[in-house]
């Protein structure tokens, strides 16, 4: 807390410049009016003030704003958007999608942290769901997003956002997140045509059911295995030997090179030893 | 450019247990299972076992069961091989190696991590 | 488990001699599961040939590989300087996946 004092002679600031560095942190406090800071807060990133002197103009804005920043100031944050807490984001009531690139550019190249989290957590709430330019948005800055979201928040994407996942985006998700986005992604790509469908469809299908994976089978997909095994074990299970082949085209002999882990090992185990042989890869049920 | 980094070298006690890292990076990680193999004195190969990042399900030469504990980490890309009650027989160079879903053999190593087991 | 026993275990070649590596397994191998890696000194070991004949990436004409069932063989048409290393055999057509002893080719 920095004691109140009162500004010295000509020392008040009539606007956010950088003449401002040179001023003490009890000046800055003294000297430098909040609603001129709030109303000049693009130019606070052009100058380089110390972190102690963006403490004090962090102590003004919130005295100015207990309650919460409003969204014109929240755009122009910069580096000070570093400063906050998530209790302090909490507060705030971000509806525009180029506040939330402005403030995510700040925290490029670094790993989410909890001031993004929160604000990503805010925004997100504010709109009701997860829109795909939003998806799009946050996707762009960190790959990981969608696989951080809990199975209840992945079931606000609407189908419509599943156009904005890319491959890598699934990376890390688990097979209760797949659990949810699949259904999502068959609706989305409901219309395409057999290839187009399987390859926009292929990082989803780790949700996919029996059933769908049957019918694939039935369209001369090629699935790899790296797609393969991703799949739901319990999905996998009941495939017959005919099945799988098909489903993997002349990528069946793969079986062999993961004979050992889930889910091929234990779709191995439920198989006749003879149906396996026709598959001439020496896989030992 | 595929690129497999494993931690400089390590000089451990007997008795201790030492844990090498293998960062992976210029693929999906998530296509590739990670193997380990062991190289004593320059000589032979001999191949610990592979963990599969999708499931963290691993597979180990029973030579190294209890010895060897493999491991991935899918959010840093990074898998690992933890040994342990480490012996003058532990001290080797340690590479990992990837190998694409589906497919035998190694197509690329990390530059090996030399364990010098003594007190 | 599969031994794999590599022969000779260290030979020498003038430049331009034709070299063959031998790989013996003690029981019988899919040939696709067979594979060969090359390793030169303080360095990891590469990926050489594949599937008992198919070439790797990058590896020259001259090598070439053969075999089935229990025998395996590396070849290299002309030996070259470069070509100096270690190669070694390797299967994963059962547990656990082996590895040769390895060959030691030096250049005379």
């Known amino acids: 807390e920095v004691e109140k004092t009162a500004c010295p002679s000509g020392k008040k600031a009539p606007e956010i410049d950088e003449s401002l560095i040179f001023y003490k942190k009890w000046e800055l406090e003294a000297c430098v009016d909040a609603a001129l800071l709030a109303t000049q807060m693009d130019r606070v990133n052009a100058i380089p003030f110390t972190y102690e002197q963006l403490d004090v103009l962090k102590h003004k804005l919130d005295e100015l704003y207990p309650q919460g920043y409003p969204e014109s100031v929240i755009q122009h944050l910069g580096y000070l958007f570093l400063k906050m807490s998530p209790e302090d984001i909490r507060k705030w009531n971000v509806t525009s999608l180029e506040t939330l690139k402005a403030l995510l550019e700040v925290n490029k190249g670094h790993e989410m942290s909890p001031q993004v989290a929160t604000l990503i957590d805010r925004f997100v709430k504010g709109r009701g769901q997860l829109d795909k330019d939003t998806l799009d948005t946050l996707t762009a800055f960190y790959p990981g997003y969608l696989c951080s979201l809990s199975p209840e928040e992945l079931s606000s994407v609407p189908p419509s956002s599943i156009w904005a996942v890319r491959p890598q985006d699934l990376d890390t998700c688990d097979p209760r997140q797949l659990d949810v986005l699949y259904p999502k992604a068959r609706l989305a790509f409901q219309n395409m045509n057999g290839s187009e469908y399987f390859v926009k469809i292929q990082s989803f299908l780790g949700g996919a059911p029996t059933e769908d994976l049957k019918a694939l089978s039935q369209q001369n997909v090629s699935m790899d295995l790296a797609t393969f095994m991703k799949l739901r074990t319990d999905a996998v299970l009941p495939l017959t030997v005919a099945e799988v082949q098909k489903l993997l085209g002349p990528h069946v002999e793969g079986l062999k090179a993961e004979e050992r882990h889930r889910p091929v090992r234990d779709w191995i185990l439920r198989q006749r030893q003879d149906d396996l042989d026709t598959l001439g890869l020496g896989l030992q049920g | 450019d595929v690129q497999l980094q494993q931690s400089g070298p390590e000089l451990v006690e007997p008795g201790a247990s030492v844990r090498i890292p293998c960062k992976a990076a210029?693929?999906?990680?998530?296509?590739?299972?990670v193997d380990w193999v062991k190289q004593s004195h320059g000589q032979s190969l001999e191949w610990i076992g592979d963990?599969?990042?999708?499931?963290?399900?691993?597979i180990y030469n029973q030579k190294f069961e209890g010895k060897a504990t493999l491991t991935v980490d899918t959010s840093s890309s990074t898998a690992y091989m933890e040994l342990r009650s480490l012996t003058s027989e532990d001290t080797a160079v340690y590479f990992c190696?990837?190998?694409?879903?589906?497919?035998?053999?190694?197509?690329?190593w990390g530059q090996g991590t030399t364990l010098t087991v003594s007190s | 488990q599969v031994v794999l026993t590599q022969s000779p275990a260290i030979m020498s070649a003038s430049p331009g001699e034709k070299v063959t590596l031998t790989c013996g397994a003690s029981?019988?191998?899919?040939?696709?599961?067979l594979y060969w890696y090359q390793q030169k000194p303080g360095s990891s070991p590469k990926l050489w040939i594949y599937?008992?004949?198919n070439l790797a990436s990058g590896v020259p004409a001259r090598f070439s590989g053969s075999g089935s069932g229990t025998s395996y063989s590396l070849t290299i048409s002309s030996m070259e300087a470069e070509d100096a290393a270690s190669y070694f055999c390797?299967?994963?057509?059962?547990?656990?996946?082996?590895f040769g002893g390895g060959t030691k080719v030096e250049i005379k």
């Open positions: 963990v599969n990042p999708n499931t963290d399900g691993a």
């Open positions: 599937s008992t004949s």
């Open positions: 029981s019988s191998l899919i040939s696709k599961y």
């Open positions: 210029g693929h999906t990680f998530t296509d590739y299972n």
């Open positions: 390797h299967q994963w057509s059962s547990y656990p996946y082996t």
């Open positions: 190696a990837r190998r694409r879903l589906g497919q035998g053999g190694f197509d690329s």
